[in-house]
């Protein structure tokens, strides 16, 4: 059964073209080809790694119930964001020895291509989504989610690992995009702000959101994560936008209320399984998705991102508990831990449902309007 | 791409020792590794595990009995301890691919070392 | 805690002949389970990982087969060199408790 969670409509953003390469060849007219924010050094868009071939044969899943209704990312309004203020600190970095994916932090040095080179590919995320520009695709279906209703045993662990707060999943969390297209969970986390400042990773027409939830996919078609790094459809995350709402959410609460025990960077709690399904969004059939990149070095191309339409809504205590308990290395609170928005470089943004309009807000510009590649063909 | 276990010798009960695994041709910053034991004429069994990024996991009835650590070449393992149940050949294995630790995956282990073997008595 | 049942514990066969290891782990572990083989004074070698992906240089003979909790290690075609003793390892996740076991080991002799 799931556990009651607040949410309202206003528009989220975030998808993938589900595709092998990216849809397109050049920048559309009124996508950003330039991050909102000033892009913390080393995560500059540059031209870089190729997606390599990557094969996905897997079983099918169930499809989840429906239940509650849900926010739209479309309906938000249009924001004008030319210039974000929201840019992440230096403060979150792992500080151990380690190669060099365990030496980066947000915003300053070293340069996340000299991390990793495939940060400065030419397809990374978070984008900007703009629903308008969106292609519908119908051929996207509601996703399929089995077995994310965990029991009390065997526990999980919690662990503030310097740039975020991140859950291990057991095996047997199965998550399929479309026949064929099928996932085990490995991990869960979160990106957010600080008071008074949003922290998601992805935004909407510029607008960003308080927090963003991230739960990170294997394909089936691949033993091991480094196996699927950089193959196209080998890792897929779903991602959700958190917002302030009225209520306390009590799943998030199941997470949030053990903050404090890993306040330091490093340490690590066990929390009881729990509904992980009840963290995302209820509605699993209005998304957007496109292909890009982790969000973190080794920034791997090729990852399919799904962004739920549908916002999830915790209380103002709650975002302030998430965003203000942790520490990063040294005295550097745990905050504004996301990434720049990188240019799309030509891709295309598909919607599982009809998100844009006939005209774009944005008279001076020309429309475009996008079409599907059938994500499952 | 090798692994080597050396330390292994005779001790008294009670008497810590610690066996060092020698790692070359990789960098334990991007391949996680698990050390293993086996009881004469006995099974394989897990001890314990430490992530690239250096944190440890061990076995319930490990947990005290061992401690892991590591420097940029080598993991040891330390029986802080040790009783005449702790006889045994010691094994230490490489995960068999590059591990991220933000993600938590794990399916074998390979190379494995020769082994070194532990003998506790009095 | 994740436990592996290893059966049978031990087997003879004849060159040539079939061999069908089983192994049940406690709880669901997808298709983390590995095959060893170990020979005398030997570490174990890694036959198969993914329940069913067959390590390199390892003959086409081994097959790994199974998802969930049960598993299966057939050896068809079998030689004198494969007489050893055969573990699984099933990988729950190393950041859970007891979440790596292996397998109480099949002797395998060849007639």
């Known amino acids: 059964q799931r556990l009651p969670r607040m949410q309202e409509d206003s528009p989220l953003g975030g998808g993938s073209s589900g595709e092998d390469d990216p849809l397109g060849e050049e920048d559309l007219p009124s996508e950003e080809d330039s991050p909102r924010e000033e892009d913390p050094p080393g995560e500059e868009d540059l031209p870089g790694e190729e997606d390599l071939p990557g094969e996905e044969d897997l079983p099918e899943v169930k499809p989840k119930s429906e239940e509650e209704g849900s926010l739209k990312l479309e309906d938000l309004p249009t924001v004008e964001a030319p210039g974000d203020p929201q840019e992440p600190q230096n403060n979150a970095h792992r500080d151990k020895e380690g190669d060099d994916q365990s030496h980066w932090r947000y915003g300053g040095d070293p340069p996340w291509p000299r991390v990793s080179p495939a940060c400065a590919g030419r397809f990374q995320s978070p984008v900007d989504i703009r629903p308008q520009l969106a292609a519908f695709c119908p051929a996207l279906r509601p996703l399929e989610l089995l077995g994310f209703q965990l029991p009390p045993l065997p526990e999980l662990r919690l662990r503030n690992n310097g740039h975020s707060v991140q859950l291990t999943l057991p095996p047997g969390l199965e998550m399929a995009l479309g026949p064929g297209r099928e996932y085990r969970a490995l991990q869960l986390h979160l990106h957010w702000g600080a008071a008074g400042r949003p922290g998601s990773e992805h935004t909407v027409e510029g607008h960003r959101f308080p927090a963003e939830i991230h739960v990170v996919h294997l394909s089936t078609a691949f033993a091991r994560v480094d196996e699927a790094l950089g193959r196209p459809g080998g890792l897929a995350v779903l991602a959700a936008f958190l917002e302030e709402g009225p209520e306390e959410n009590s799943a998030y609460e199941q997470l949030l209320s053990r903050l404090e025990e890993i306040a330091e960077e490093g340490s690590e709690t066990q929390v009881p399984g729990l509904d992980i399904s009840a963290l995302l969004p209820s509605d699993f059939s209005r998304y957007f998705q496109y292909e890009g990149s982790l969000t973190t070095p080794p920034c791997a191309q090729g990852v399919i991102w799904t962004v739920f339409n549908q916002t999830v809504m915790l209380s103002a205590k709650q975002l302030h508990t998430l965003s203000d308990t942790l520490w990063g290395p040294g005295d550097s609170r745990l905050q504004l831990n996301f990434r720049a928005t990188q240019p799309l470089n030509g891709r295309v943004i598909e919607a599982s449902f009809p998100a844009g309009v006939d005209s774009s807000p944005r008279a001076a510009e020309p429309v475009q309007l996008n079409s599907c590649l059938a994500a499952g063909d | 791409q090798s692994v080597k276990e050396s330390g292994g010798r005779l001790v008294t009960p009670g008497t810590p020792l610690t066996l060092t695994c020698t790692v070359s041709?990789?960098?334990?910053?991007?391949?996680?590794m698990i050390w293993v034991r086996q009881a004469p004429g006995e099974g394989l069994e897990y001890i314990g595990f430490?992530?690239?990024?250096?944190t440890t996991y061990y076995a319930s009835w490990a947990k005290g009995r061992f401690t892991i650590s590591r420097t940029s070449t080598t993991v040891d393992l330390k029986l802080t301890r040790p009783t005449t149940e702790d006889t045994a050949t010691y094994f230490c294995?490489?995960?068999?691919?590059?591990?991220?630790?933000?993600?938590?995956?794990?399916?074998?282990?390979?190379?494995w070392g020769p082994g070194t073997l532990v003998t506790i008595s009095s | 805690e994740l436990v592996m049942t290893q059966t049978p514990s031990s087997v003879s066969a004849a060159v040539g002949g079939t061999v069908t290891i089983n192994c049940q782990a406690s709880?669901?572990?997808?298709?983390?389970l590995a095959w060893y083989q170990q020979k005398p004074g030997q570490p174990p070698k890694l036959l198969i990982y993914?329940?069913?992906t067959l390590a390199s240089g390892v003959p086409s003979r081994f097959k790994g087969s199974g998802s969930g909790t049960e598993f299966t290690l057939t050896i068809t075609g079998v030689q004198c060199d494969d007489a050893a003793t055969y573990y699984c390892?099933?990988?729950?996740?190393?950041?859970?408790?007891?979440?790596?076991?292996f397998g109480g080991g099949t002797e395998l002799e060849i007639k």
């Open positions: 390892l099933g990988v729950y996740g190393y950041s859970f408790d007891d979440g790596i076991a």
């Open positions: 993914y329940a069913s």
């Open positions: 041709g990789f960098s334990l910053n991007s391949y996680a």
């Open positions: 709880q669901s572990i997808s298709s983390y």
């Open positions: 294995a490489r995960d068999r691919v590059k591990s991220y630790d933000d993600y938590g995956d794990l399916d074998a282990f390979e190379p």
């Open positions: 430490i992530t690239t990024g250096g």
